[in-house]
């Protein structure tokens, strides 16, 4: 089992992830692990020499880069917020701010926009991943209502008047709650103080 550097006539290396072909010497050399970069290139007699990325820089993959990438903050102007910091082994992790969705994607999200409001009587369909797409508004299911224009309001169950010792005055709709009233109408003024048996 040859250890880098070793000769390669067919320009391929056994471990594509951790080795690379160096055409000048026609050899396979070690890549540098995540969090490091090439500080000295390999030769026929010496393998790649790696060094740790300096503060505020990173390399995410096994590489033969002679520099590390500069850490960049998430851009709040583009509606992004940070969920995890940059380390020597990974770039800053960003996501759309609450109430926004990803509107432009180039390997990662580059621009977020405000989620559309869902009108009364509807709610946003729940997605597997928050911030991945704009709202798709769906009607409230039977027995539920939602009475605002909002990107995030959820349909709520109609009030059950009987649970509060009341009776229904007007039924609930998709846009409004049930209206309840007291089952005992107030006594007429002339009968107040009189007890009906």
């Amino acid at each position: 089992q040859a250890v880098p550097p070793y000769a390669s006539e067919n320009q391929t290396c056994r471990d594509q992830e951790k080795e690379y072909y160096e055409p000048q010497h026609r050899i396979c050399c070690s890549r540098c692990p995540p969090g490091t970069y090439v500080s000295a290139k390999c030769s026929r007699i010496r393998d790649t020499v790696c060094a740790t990325c300096a503060e505020n820089s990173y390399n995410e993959h096994w590489n033969y880069l002679t520099i590390c990438q500069l850490c960049r903050p998430c851009d709040p102007v583009m509606g992004l917020e940070e969920i995890a910091p940059c380390t020597s082994k990974r770039k800053t992790q960003c996501r759309c701010q609450p109430g926004m969705f990803c509107a432009a994607w180039a390997l990662e999200c580059t621009h977020c926009e405000l989620l559309s409001d869902c009108p009364p009587g509807t709610e946003a369909e729940l997605k597997d991943e928050v911030g991945k797409g704009n709202n798709h508004c769906v009607p409230c299911k039977a027995g539920h209502f939602q009475n605002t224009s909002s990107p995030s309001a959820r349909c709520q169950p109609h009030t059950r008047c009987e649970n509060q010792g009341l009776v229904e005055a007007a039924p609930g709709t998709a846009q409004s709650d049930t209206t309840c009233k007291n089952p005992l109408e107030p006594l007429p003024p002339e009968m107040s103080g009189t007890m009906l048996m």
Partner: antibody, heavy 116, light 107 residues
């Protein structure tokens, strides 16, 4: 060498606000995140939030959202942490710290006492 | 939020002893864990980052290990200046969280 020098101890009344400063030197102020961490007596260290002075954007721990404001003045390389609606539980040592795979650099700490 | 559960909360040891402190994360944090030493009235000092990398100037008797959810700080031979409180911290995701500390006292 990197230095973070914080303002002096403060005694505050409940309901009031406190503003602690952290003056940075020995590095490019605008390219590193500055965080605020507090340590109440007998309690765990608690991360409050950070500011990136390059774009003066701050992000906060949900626990303190609405009560904490972190700002930075690029001209003086100084970061500030203001905590409002103070209560007795906010009595703590407040630290600023510069991050990179942990916190390699810390200020000396500012003791804030909240007492009526 | 990710909880960092540190144990023991305190321990008594003698100079020359081998001391081990553990920290358990409530979810996977990769190797994004740091260890600190703190003495009374002072700010914490970074000892270890990326779970096992000794910070510059930290004596070789301090070592860190672990990944995922289980992490360990080991002091191979305790010195008089090592009596202090030690904290772990995850910096994998916000909000950053700390263990509540292990106080190393003289037996």
């Amino acid at each position: 060498q990197v230095q973070l020098v914080q303002s002096g101890a403060e005694v505050k009344k409940p309901g009031s606000s406190v503003k602690v400063s952290c003056k940075a030197s020995g590095y490019t102020f605008t390219t590193y995140y500055l965080h605020w961490v507090r340590q109440a007596p007998g309690q765990c260290l608690e991360w409050m939030g950070w500011i990136y002075p390059g774009n003066v954007h701050a992000q906060y721990n949900e626990k303190f959202k609405g009560r904490v404001t972190i700002t930075a003045d690029k001209s003086t390389s100084t970061a500030y942490m203001e905590l409002s609606s103070l209560r007795s539980e906010d009595t703590a040592v407040y630290y600023c710290a510069r991050s990179w795979e942990g916190f390699p650099y810390w200020g000396q700490g500012t003791t804030v006492t909240v007492s009526s | 939020d990710i909880q960092m559960t540190q144990s023991p909360s305190s321990l008594s040891a003698s100079v020359g002893d081998r001391v081990t402190i553990t920290c358990k994360a409530s979810q996977n944090v990769g190797i994004n864990v740091a260890w600190y030493q703190q003495k009374p009235g002072k700010a914490p000092k970074l000892l270890i980052s990326s779970a096992s990398y000794r910070y510059s100037g930290v004596p070789s008797r301090f070592s860190g290990s672990g990944s995922g959810t289980d992490f360990t700080l080991t002091i191979s031979s305790l010195q008089p200046e090592d009596f202090a409180t030690y904290f772990c911290q995850q910096y994998d995701t916000y909000p950053f969280t700390f263990g509540c500390g292990t106080k190393v006292e003289i037996k």
